[in-house]
Interface confidence: low
């Protein structure tokens, strides 16, 4: 069977949208009117992994792009990155699992926390226009809280 | 070809210290993690700690915990294990071993000859 | 930790015929479709060798009558056709809970 996918929206707990900077970067900051079409849609598919009711594992495509998030150690630090795929071979079920990213619900809010790399979570910085990242902390000065706007294919 | 070479290993008093070194030669040994695995005479293996890359991370089986230590000198391609506090049942075989780090799964791929340690009064 | 018991601890066997050693872990050893389990061989007076990773992958330049199997709790690695240089102990390996890397007593595999 293919593998389940949804088109979606990310914002950060303060509200900041998520827009390609350069290639291989994502940023956060705050978009209001037109400038929300710059957002990035993801492609959120349910992939094979670990579940219980408030963890699912999914992977995080951008939309009608052959890019993955994922997760890789970059000299020693768990690391956010954009990776190219073969989009003949992508979504899959199985996928690796540094594309892989624990769906967590708590308060509606989600929480996106690597598979590769146990409590590093995708994160933002309070400040404007800095690049998402993978964080260690949670609670902490750096964002992890994430709502999800469903975009219809 | 990859080639680690122990030494440090001999005779050691019960309560006393010893410090193993590893030399590494025929890779990038600053990209790869590292373990300790030691063998008592005549019986299994036993993992005793790792070491990430750049020695970010650093991981210990909890018979050692808090007696031995894991450390890298990275330009030297050297691992270290500081041992504290050695009790008779520390006497083993210790190997270093390089980890194949591959989706999270500690594989050890290439060992050392390994040297030996004796903990006895 | 996960505990990995492997039988039988010896095993005889004749040339060119099948060995066959089980490992079998407390809990289950899968990651994400991965099963994280390890052979090595170690003969006498030498260091382990990496043989199978992942369950059933084949390391580079070990000979193609080294197999690996299994999922979940239940692995086992195969020898066929038996070869005098196979005699040795064999010893599984479970990565799944990192940081307590666990290995199973040993099998001793010698000729009949």
């Known amino acids: 069977a293919p593998v389940r996918s949804l088109n979606c929206t990310l914002r950060d707990s303060q509200q900041k949208s998520l827009v390609m900077s350069g290639p291989y970067e994502l940023k956060a900051l705050h978009l209001q009117g037109q400038d929300m079409e710059q957002q990035v849609v993801f492609s959120m598919s349910f992939v094979q992994g670990e579940e219980s009711n408030d963890k699912i594992p999914v992977a995080l495509g951008l939309k009608e792009k052959n890019l993955y998030l994922s997760c890789v150690l970059k000299d020693d630090k768990p690391t956010l990155q954009l990776e190219s795929v073969d989009p003949k071979n992508y979504p899959k079920k199985k996928m690796e699992k540094r594309f892989v990213f624990n769906k967590i619900e708590i308060n509606n809010k989600l929480e996106f926390e690597s598979a590769q790399f146990p409590n590093w979570y995708i994160s933002t910085s309070q400040a404007e226009n800095m690049p998402v990242f993978l964080g260690g902390t949670k609670g902490g000065q750096d964002i992890t809280d994430f709502t999800m706007q469903f975009v219809s294919s | 070809d990859v080639q680690l070479v122990e030494s440090g290993g001999g005779l050691v008093q019960p309560g006393g210290s010893r410090k193993l070194s590893c030399a590494a030669s025929g890779f990038t040994f600053s990209t790869f993690g590292m373990h300790w695995v030691r063998q008592a005479p005549e019986k299994g293996l036993e993992w005793v700690a790792y070491i990430s890359s750049g020695s970010y991370t650093t991981y210990y089986a909890d018979t050692v915990r808090g007696r031995f230590t894991i450390s890298r000198d990275n330009p030297k391609n050297t691992l270290f294990l500081q041992m504290t506090s050695l009790r008779s049942e520390d006497t083993a075989m210790y190997y270093c071993?390089?980890?194949?780090?591959?989706?999270?799964?500690?594989?050890?791929?290439?060992w050392g000859q390994g040297t030996s340690v004796t903990v006895s009064s | 930790d996960i505990v990995l018991t492997q039988s039988p601890a010896s095993l005889a066997v004749s040339l060119g015929q099948r060995a066959t050693i089980s490992c079998r872990a407390s809990e289950s050893v899968e990651y994400y479709g991965t099963s994280l389990m390890q052979w090595y061989q170690q003969k006498p007076g030498q260091p382990p060798k990496l043989l199978i990773y992942?369950?059933?992958n084949v390391e580079s330049g070990v000979p193609a009558r080294f197999t690996g199997s299994g999922s979940g709790t239940v692995f086992s690695l195969n020898i066929h056709p038996v070869e005098e240089d196979d005699i040795a102990m064999y010893f599984c390996q479970q990565s799944r809970k990192v940081p307590s890397l666990t290995f199973g007593a040993g099998t001793k595999l010698e000729l009949k």
């Open positions: 071993a390089r980890d194949d780090y591959d989706v999270s799964n500690y594989v050890m791929d290439y």
């Open positions: 992942a369950a059933s």
